[in-house]
Interface confidence: medium
């Protein structure tokens, strides 16, 4: 149905030997990403958080699909993870490596 | 070709007629709103200043396009414009209606 | 620091077009909107019309069509475009800034309008 | 479509206070804020009170606006009048149609 299609966080785990990303981070060797997936139709939930740019446009798109895109369902808030990497050629320790992690996501 | 259908900021004129908002926004009658459009595929360029998790996302679709969507091409910067607006009946001057006009956009 | 300046002609024939510029400095007309007020020789303002920030425009209906007005933002500039010009249109034209209220006006350019 | 009505002069001592009117013809005055302008001969006006009763930076706080809703009138009040206050002031307002409208101006004279 068109609610289970919604705009929400999903599952999406990283490998970071699949994306080449173990040639420098050590530790740890994948982790839980998430994706926001699904639709921004109009109305626009609250929980979405949809700037008013993104309601006008879903407005839009509603009347007159060719006039503009849907507003897109994209990470709001994001979370950092702790990772070990190399630092010429030096391992170290990064506490928060921002913007790794979807927390929310959104209608923008 | 593909740098031509790359993530930007395209024309969107919203007419506050045609979305029903002209009555409690009295002026202006509408305004560049713009929208962002196009494909955010990897790699993705440093002025659509991507978080890293669409970096990693973008790079997981190139790789394997079933387990992760691609990034999103959405407003990343936006700009208040002035209107003139009515509130319990009361004709109201808000300088900075925020959120309104896509200023930049990039992939998320 | 903030300046608007207002260029154009002194003197139009009536029924030629009126074309002036007002040449901004000191912010953006992306962030602040630009009014156009114009003031007859001893008499009162008129509003004319406003360049909205976000690029809509709004005019007074008193100049039915025969009014553009229109912006070169990468050039900082506002202008101001009217036909069938009139006696009666000769005036002060200012352009001013509004932001929360009116803050900045340029100096003003007397236009007469005779033959 | 409203017009603002202002007495055309008025006249004034140093020292003195004074009350210059802004009457809304039709339509309640309080429905938009109103705006005073003060221009001295040869220059261009600058804003003295804006939303009804907010002085802008440098504004001396001899100027106040305020709201009579029995008289549908605004009112800019001018304490200690200084010869410097001789000027034409301008009431400004919005309508909905028009969208920004002026009254006829009052010249203050400082005797």
């Known amino acids: 149905n068109a609610k289970g299609n919604y705009c929400k966080r999903t599952p999406l785990y990283i490998d970071f030997k699949e994306i080449g990303w173990d040639s420098w981070i050590i530790a740890p060797p994948g982790y839980e990403a998430y994706e926001c997936r699904g639709v921004c139709n109009y109305p626009l939930a609250e929980h979405l958080t949809p700037t008013k740019h993104a309601i006008i446009q879903a407005l839009v798109h509603l009347k007159n699909s060719q006039k503009a895109s849907k507003a897109c369902c994209v990470p709001t808030k994001l979370e950092p993870i702790s990772i070990l990497y190399l630092d010429k050629g030096v391992v170290t320790y990064k506490f928060k490596y921002e913007g790794m992690a979807v927390s929310e996501c959104g209608c923008r | 070709n593909a740098k031509g259908n790359y993530c930007k900021r395209t024309p969107l004129y919203i007419d506050f007629k045609e979305i029903g908002w002209d009555s409690w926004i009295i002026a202006p009658p509408g305004y560049e709103a713009y929208e962002c459009r196009g494909v955010c595929n990897y790699p993705l360029a440093e002025h659509l200043t991507p978080t890293k998790h669409a970096i990693i996302q973008a790079l997981v679709h190139l790789k394997n396009s079933q387990k992760a969507s691609k990034a999103c091409c959405v407003p990343t910067k936006l700009e208040p414009i002035s209107i003139l607006y009515l509130d319990k009946g009361v004709v109201t001057y808000k300088f900075k209606y925020e959120g309104m006009a896509v200023s930049e956009c990039g992939c998320r | 620091q903030v300046q608007l300046q207002e260029s154009g002609p002194d003197l139009v024939q009536p029924s030629q077009t009126l074309d002036i510029t007002c040449t901004v400095s000191g912010f953006s007309l992306t962030t602040y909107n630009v009014h156009w007020v114009r003031q007859p020789p001893g008499k009162g303002l008129e509003w004319m019309g406003t360049m909205w920030n976000g690029g809509g425009i709004d005019y007074n209906s008193a100049f039915k069509s025969r009014l553009a007005i229109s912006r070169d933002t990468s050039k900082n500039e506002v202008f101001l475009k009217m036909d069938s010009l009139q006696t009666d249109d000769t005036a002060k034209y200012f352009c001013a800034r509004l932001g929360y209220y009116v803050d900045y006006w340029g100096q003003g350019i007397l236009v007469t309008v005779s033959s | 479509q409203f017009v603002l009505i202002q007495s055309d002069s008025m006249s004034t001592s140093a020292g003195s206070t004074v009350k210059l009117s802004c009457k809304r013809s039709t339509g309640n005055i309080g429905s938009s804020y109103v705006y005073w302008y003060q221009q001295h001969e040869g220059r261009s006006p600058t804003t003295m009170i804006y939303?009804?009763?907010?002085?802008p930076d440098g504004v001396p706080d001899r100027f106040s606006g305020s709201i009579d809703s029995s008289s549908n009138s605004a009112s800019l009040t001018i304490n200690n009048v200084q010869i410097e206050d001789e000027a034409v002031y301008f009431c400004q307002s919005f309508s909905s149609g028009i969208k920004f409208i002026f009254g006829g101006g009052t010249k203050l004279t400082v005797l």
């Open positions: 939303d009804g009763d907010k002085r």
